[in-house]
């Protein structure tokens, strides 16, 4: 074992090339320089180096940076990325975006593994907060990115960046998520005019409240029913079936067809059975005329 | 080294208030979305409030909602929790905490002891 | 509110022994985004609770590989492979799938 430590005459290596792959684990070890790997990083990304010789040249530059890597080694890690855990990104300042993009694209086409879960928290961080050119480029790579961050995390992003969202990235958000994008897309698209303003805060009306329903129900706005269907219940519920109705528009049909499924069961439930009937759609399950309707919310309220 | 250290808890009759603060070092605490979690004396921890990291947002659960206030101070690093109207049940550690980038508690405090007694 | 139980209250080893931890939810913990927000804390005596596991299975920084999490949905599962002296203390499971974030009802490795 003594003597494998030893670089083996004429082996050491001038500069990162094809001619390594040949090398044993423990030649890579005793012949490459680390500071020679580190200003040839970008060269490592065009040698099919196995996985086995990729720790080695790993354990190198952890040798050479135990602190963590500076970003001149960390933009050109290429697939010796793929190799870092988050204890090691930890230990980045990574700042520059083009650093950024270059280590997401060696992860292009996966799921966001923890790495790069990590890499991204470390981004964002250093520079404070989730800006419009940051988040173009996450979304670009993980449509799902800003659904992935917590509604804490979200209650930071500044209503600029809102307009780099596209609907599809808000698919996997849950309520509370949206409940927090929401009044953020509200002051972001404020100047917008009617049906423009419609189009860009309709992905987000699942973290709107009854108020900017009713609101919305005075435009014309035709609403469909897929984006129906995800409006918080509680915000539905207050709505009248004029207002519904006119929230709806043409897709008021639609209703029939979601009549046992939440928000539209609930909110049958808590209409006059009279009001329901104008719709001349069928939906059945409404209070029945004569009945007195408490407010079960104002009561518990008083309280 | 990344620390939080609490400070503020008493011994406070029921209908009082406290003040808790916690002292942030060795991260950039203008960074992170920060916590109040609690140990009751049955072992329980329970969260208690979350505060983004520029302070706009805050976060409770029903049980202290409208009791307790979490802010926090960027220039000072530090994070406090206003607790009014306490309550017997409010008996507990309370610890700072750092809420993470895969939404975990990665760091926390030593806690400062709250008790609620007549 | 999301309940979280957690099985054994209290579970007595020898050092070496595998050590296993059960938790389960009132609901399913897969957030809508497909990430699942099951984590294991463990304070020690006299300590604060520390992070071990995150979303289900990540060992977190410095944590020992014989610790391991496993499970979906509404069941996990904390394994120590080879219980040291160091590991004894409260554990707890925790989600944040759901708001408000709950814990686990905590489990106590002792000594036999």
């Known amino acids: 074992e003594v003597e494998k430590t030893a670089c083996p005459s004429g082996k050491k290596a001038r500069e990162i090339d094809e001619s390594l792959i040949f090398y044993k684990k423990w030649e890579l070890e005793a012949c490459v320089d680390a500071a020679l790997l580190a200003t040839q990083m970008d060269r490592v990304n065009a040698i099919p180096f196995t996985y086995e010789q990729l720790d080695v040249l790993k354990h190198k530059l952890d040798e050479l940076y135990p602190q963590g890597y500076p970003e001149s080694v960390i933009q050109h890690l290429g697939y010796l990325f793929l190799k870092m855990s988050p204890e090691d990104i930890r230990k980045w300042n990574v700042t520059s975006l083009e650093t950024l993009k270059a280590l997401l694209e060696v992860n292009k086409g996966h799921e966001m593994s923890p790495q790069v879960a990590t890499l991204i928290d470390r981004f964002v961080k250093g520079r404070g907060q989730l800006d419009k050119d940051t988040l173009d480029t996450l979304t670009a790579f993980y449509p799902g990115y800003l659904c992935s961050l917590s509604p804490e995390e979200l209650s930071s992003v500044p209503p600029s960046s809102i307009w780099a969202v596209r609907p599809q990235d808000l698919d996997t958000c849950d309520p509370r998520q949206l409940d927090v994008l929401y009044p953020k897309a509200r002051l972001a698209f404020q100047n917008m005019n009617g049906s423009e303003y419609f189009v860009k805060i309709q992905s987000f009306l699942g973290g709107a409240p009854t108020e900017d329903l009713k609101a919305l129900s005075q435009q014309n706005v035709s609403m469909d029913l897929a984006t129906f269907m995800k409006l918080r219940t509680d915000a539905v519920l207050p709505l009248t079936v004029a207002e519904v109705q006119k929230l709806l528009g043409p897709h008021v049909e639609g209703l029939k067809a979601e009549e046992r499924h939440r928000p539209v069961r609930d909110w049958i439930l808590r209409q006059r059975q009279d009001d329901l009937d104008t719709l001349g759609l069928g939906l059945q399950g409404g209070i029945p005329n004569g009945y007195l309707v408490l407010d079960l919310s104002m009561q518990e309220a008083l309280s | 080294e990344v620390m939080l250290v609490e400070s503020g808890g008493d011994l406070v009759k029921p209908g009082g208030s406290l003040k808790l603060s916690c002292a942030a070092s060795g991260f950039t605490f203008s960074s992170y979305a920060m916590s109040w979690v609690r140990r009751t004396p049955e072992k329980r921890l329970e969260w208690v409030a979350t505060i983004n990291s520029d302070g706009s947002y805050t976060f409770y659960p029903d049980s202290v909602k409208g009791r307790f206030t979490i802010s926090r101070d960027n220039a000072k690093n530090t994070l406090y929790l206003q607790m009014n109207s306490l309550r017997s049940e409010d008996t507990a550690m309370y610890y700072c905490a750092r809420w993470g980038e895969n939404w975990y508690f990665d760091v926390w405090g030593a806690g400062t002891t709250v008790t609620v007694s007549s | 509110d999301v309940v979280m139980t957690q099985t054994p209250l209290s579970l007595p080893v020898s050092l070496g022994d595998q050590a296993s931890i059960s938790c389960r939810s009132s609901q399913s913990l897969v957030h809508s985004n497909g990430n699942t927000y099951l984590h294991w804390y463990l304070q020690k005596p006299g300590q604060s609770p520390k992070l071990l596991i995150y979303?289900?299975?990540n060992r977190f920084s410095g944590v020992p590989d014989r610790f391991s999490g496993s499970g979906s949905g509404t069941d996990f599962t904390l394994k120590i492979s080879r219980v040291e002296a160091e590991d004894l203390g409260i554990y707890f499971c925790s989600q944040s799938t759901h708001f408000p974030r709950t814990f686990g009802g905590a489990t106590k490795l002792e000594l036999k």
């Open positions: 979303k289900v299975s």
